[in-house]
Amino acid sequence: EAHKSEIAHRYNDLGEQHFKGLVLIAFSQYLQKCSYDEHAKLVQEVTDFAKTCVADESAANCDKSLHTLFGDKLCAIPNLRENYGELADCCTKQEPERNECFLQHKDDNPSLPPFERPEAEAMCTSFKENPTTFMGHYLHEVARRHPYFYAPELLYYAEQYNEILTQCCAEADKESCLTPKLDGVKEKALVSSVRQRMKCSSMQKFGERAFKAWAVARLSQTFPNADFAEITKLATDLTKVNKECCHGDLLECADDRAELAKYMCENQATISSKLQTCCDKPLLKKAHCLSEVEHDTMPADLPAIAADFVEDQEVCKNYAEAKDVFLGTFLYEYSRRHPDYSVSLLLRLAKKYEATLEKCCAEANPPACYGTVLAEFQPLVEEPKNLVKTNCDLYEKLGEYGFQNAILVRYTQKAPQVSTPTLVEAARNLGRVGTKCCTLPEDQRLPCVEDYLSAILNRVCLLHEKTPVSEHVTKCCSGSLVERRPCFSALTVDETYVPKEFKAETFTFHSDICTLPEKEKQIKKQTALAELVKHKPKATAEQLKTVMDDFAQFLDTCCKAADKDTCFSTEGPNLVTRCKDALA
């Protein structure tokens, strides 16, 4: 229904706390370089204005759209051109072009320092002094580094953060209480960020239809007892929510997400038997819980998929007269029978089915032509199953760090032109799939592995888009989203690459490496490994292992030495010589 004042409507629906949080996230995602204080001031102004509209919906400017109100605020920021360059040109445009322009200027890799966590005592002091400001800083810092973070989920993570601090700051040993808990939240939030970015990419590149297909598959897996009409309704609503968040309409997105959670909890009987625990929780926890609820038990009496989609005489009629509905039904029926498949795989199978019908329904004897379609799915299913087996076996053998290194070598060979920091980041993220998925029960591994890898590779594509350097990467990134992972997996050594010259300084280290945290040490070593591969793209695994073992030994020796600096300056050049010889 239409409201006289959109801003008053959203303020009333969301309540002041969530309203302010979402406005802060929106501003931080649009203008990623502004300080917290600058954004906090704007948020307060917007909130005060919203309150005047709540008191009187007919007050001046209360009838303006949220894009107009927020855009005007952003465009009034002093020194916009000095700080943001051509983004300032957006302010010469009218809505809706102005908002589109802001969206296009979101930076997936802003040049901001890593978000450093203060030490426990300091954190607890500032949290106790002003919890609201403390949480505001958290929202601001995460949102500006992750401009597509799913806003209502970010409020959920802030709430988690708040609860952890409340609990741990009352403990004697704050550090050992906070560290593992906050690490857990950080890990989950980072995964949430890449997953949401993938959804926005799907929406931006391929439109709502592509996202809705993703949603139908995912929801059908989770709610196999819901019928197609129910799944379609949920998928349509979920598509709207994600479209709004990806489009920067964060207030509408959070409001609609709350509505969807409410609908699901009021209609559990026709959706799933597993929702009650989620539905007993308060709003943010409820919506989060519903988004990752366990799969309902599959109905026992599902007929074979072939009956409707292969054996029936009316397949071509159904397809011709209502393509989207028929293919949607196929995707629903196949997905509800296969919670053990990844969404990407299910979408590839639906695409294969569609292509088969396109071809066969134009032939003289369609049933003879499409009669083998289900058998033709086999290689498409085997490929990711083999990928999971091979990679999980390797992970179990090497552990997370060793597995990341194996992936780093593989991907540097596939795309040696890509910058080393991007390769290292990608390999570290791809390598985490082992810890995240390989320990799961067999039937959960494939969906976990492939859908996670697809999300990480989406980030690789986004970073590569900014500065395209590898034809291999361009080829895989320009195809459809669901084909990306198989495309990357199929890449081999890039034969067109001219190896990098060996530069001794790339492999020269100093004693400061000894005091770095373990993670930073790993990154330094992985940077060296990527550079080695760029120098010798066809080096064998054995050669690389020899060099890396030597390198690890060198670091261990020198970091234990009484005179570290002397050790690094004398042993370092010897290491470089040995490396060159080992790779010759």
């Epitope: 819901a226 019928d227 007929p303 409707d308 397949v315 028929f326």
Partner: nanobody, 126 residues
Framework: EVQLLESGGGLVQPGGSLRLSCAAS????????VAWFRQAPGKGREFVAG????????YYADSVKGRFTISRDNSKNTLYLQMNSLRPEDTAVYYC???????????????????WGQGTLVTVSS
């Protein structure tokens, strides 16, 4: 739970007409694939006509094409079968069946329909 109730059957002379109705409750009729089947004494259930849910695609058995018309009235949540030019071989108990959640009729196989009415008898005889 879906309930279906057929009505409109009776005795009719060859060449005559009848209109069968199937009232549904517990589910909107436009959201689900619905079909008419018939069963003559000593025979299995045979597909007569069907209509898709959400999309008005209609399907007919070859033996009734041009004589029977399937339709529905969403406001009344009712399915109809208009039967013209009736023949003695059309004599049977007529059932309506539904496959909730199937937006299209994708089968003429009775086993794939989980919900049925109790049937209405149609006798074509002079």
């Amino acid at each position: 739970e879906v309930q279906l109730l057929e009505s409109g059957g009776g005795l009719v002379q060859p060449g005559g007409s009848l209109r069968l109705s199937c009232a549904a409750s517990g589910r909107y009729i436009d959201e689900t694939a619905v079909a008419w089947f018939r069963q003559a004494p000593g025979k299995g259930r045979e597909f007569v006509a069907g209509i898709g849910g959400g999309v008005d695609i209609t399907y007919y058995a070859d033996s009734v094409k041009g004589r029977f018309t399937i339709s529905r009235d969403n406001s009344k949540n009712t399915l109809y079968l208009q039967m013209n030019s009736l023949r003695p071989e059309d004599t049977a108990v007529y059932y309506c069946g539904t496959r909730p959640g199937r937006p299209l009729i994708t089968s003429k196989v009775a086993d794939l329909y989980p919900y049925w009415g109790q049937g209405t008898l149609v006798t074509v005889s002079s």
